[in-house]
């Protein structure tokens, strides 16, 4: 039975040209994490694998940095970065846990962080 939960940074907003940290945390499970994928809609941004470390997709190499921890930092944000982001935890023996973050990139200087929420 999958007992874990993923806590994410939830709905967040940031300024155009700025940077933002996307974070997910898997808790309430003793399953071993073998890989964490970060995806934007259907595009792979980055992978952190237990044996191979980090891999950043070539098309995002200039604007994506790993960390802190298993999070992901997006830099030089554009309005086109607005959308859904997913963290996908591959675990053994539980299987896959997925967290969702919605990022809105704003033209204005008013960018407030949304509340955190949990995805069972």
């Amino acid at each position: 039975m999958m007992t874990g939960t993923i806590e994410t940074t939830g709905n967040i907003s940031a300024e155009k040209g700025g940077s933002i940290i996307l974070q997910c945390h898997l808790s309430s499970t003793t399953a071993q994490v073998t890989q964490v994928n970060w995806e934007q809609q259907d595009q792979l941004l980055a992978i952190c694998n237990a044996d191979l470390g980090w891999h950043i997709s070539p098309s995002f190499k200039d604007r994506v940095a790993p960390g802190p921890g298993l999070g992901l930092t997006l830099q030089s944000l554009t309005v086109n970065d607005t959308g859904e982001y997913f963290c996908i935890y591959h675990t053994y023996p539980d299987g896959t846990y997925t967290g969702r973050i919605f990022l809105e990139v704003l033209e204005s200087s008013v960018a407030e962080h949304g509340a955190r929420f949990q995805i069972p």
């Epitope: 974070q23 003793t30 470390g53 980090w54 891999h55 950043i56 190499k61 940095a65 960390g67 802190p68």
Partner: antibody, heavy 117, light 107 residues
Framework: QVQLQQPGSELVRPGASVKLSCKAS????????IHWVKQRHGQGLEWIGN????????NYDERFKNMGTLTVDTSSNTAYMDLSSLTSEDSAVYYC??????????WGQGTTLTVSS | DIVLTQSPATLSVTPGDSVSLSCRAS??????LHWFQQKSHESPRLLIN???QSISGIPSRFRGGGSGTDFTLSINSLETEDFGMYFC?????????FGGGTKLEIK
């Protein structure tokens, strides 16, 4: 097997500079963070900063920002920490460690830096 | 910066005893807490990853728990090789920070 190799010791004069090295082997150097940690004799561990060899991205603790610079040479799989304007307070063991999915799963043996006239 | 407070500073116990070490964070760090053991004149060794994830090669008597601000490292039936220093580390945000350590000594 994964290894982080550091020189055993360095002796420098007060006010001088030193370049500490950490040579990685047994894994893809550009896929893991390299962290630097300070430990004064018989004391706790202090995080200095980190660098991601794949991009050169780095982060520092504010306390160490003005005294050191982190760099990498991906051709030799070596991370460096430049320390300048050294004082006796900088005498310590300096460790490098890597981070991927696991935090600090491999550590170097540490370099004992002695600042003395 | 996030401050990690470890307690007790020193713990005197007998081999065979079971102990719990505490690490408290100054703010919510979710599960981004890691435990290390360090023996005299040696490099630290990772024991527990992300609060409760076990590490290959580490005896099963070491168990981690907690989330948010309060974390524990439990050691079941201590062996003589377990004595030394224990440190926690947070990786929730930069700068990463270590706790001050707990010294586990033989009574």
């Amino acid at each position: 097997q994964v290894q982080l190799q550091q020189p055993g010791s360095e002796l420098v004069r007060p006010g001088a500079s030193v370049k500490l090295s950490c040579k990685a082997s047994g894994y893809t150097f550009t896929s893991y963070w390299i962290h630097w940690v300070k430990q004064r004799h018989g004391q706790g561990l202090e995080w200095i900063g980190n660098i991601f060899p794949g991009s050169g991205t780095s982060n520092y603790d504010e306390r160490f920002k003005n005294m050191g610079t982190l760099t990498v040479d991906t051709s030799s799989n070596t991370a460096y920490m430049d320390l300048s304007s050294l004082t006796s307070e900088d005498s310590a063991v300096y460790y490098c460690a890597r981070e991927g999915l696991y935090a600090f799963d491999y550590w170097g043996q540490g370099t004992t830096l002695t600042v003395s006239s | 910066d996030i401050v990690l407070t470890q307690s007790p500073a020193t713990l005197s116990v007998t081999p065979g005893d079971s102990v719990s070490l505490s690490c408290r964070a100054s703010q919510n760090i979710r599960n981004s807490l890691h435990w290390f053991q360090q023996k005299s004149h040696e490099s630290p060794r990772l024991l527990i990853n992300y609060a409760s994830q076990s590490i290959s090669g580490i005896p099963s008597r070491f168990r981690g728990g907690g989330s948010g601000t309060d974390f524990t490292l439990s050691i079941n039936s201590l062996e003589t090789e377990d004595f030394g220093m224990y440190f926690c580390l947070q990786s929730n945000s930069w700068p990463y920070t270590f706790g001050g350590g707990t010294k586990l000594e033989i009574k």
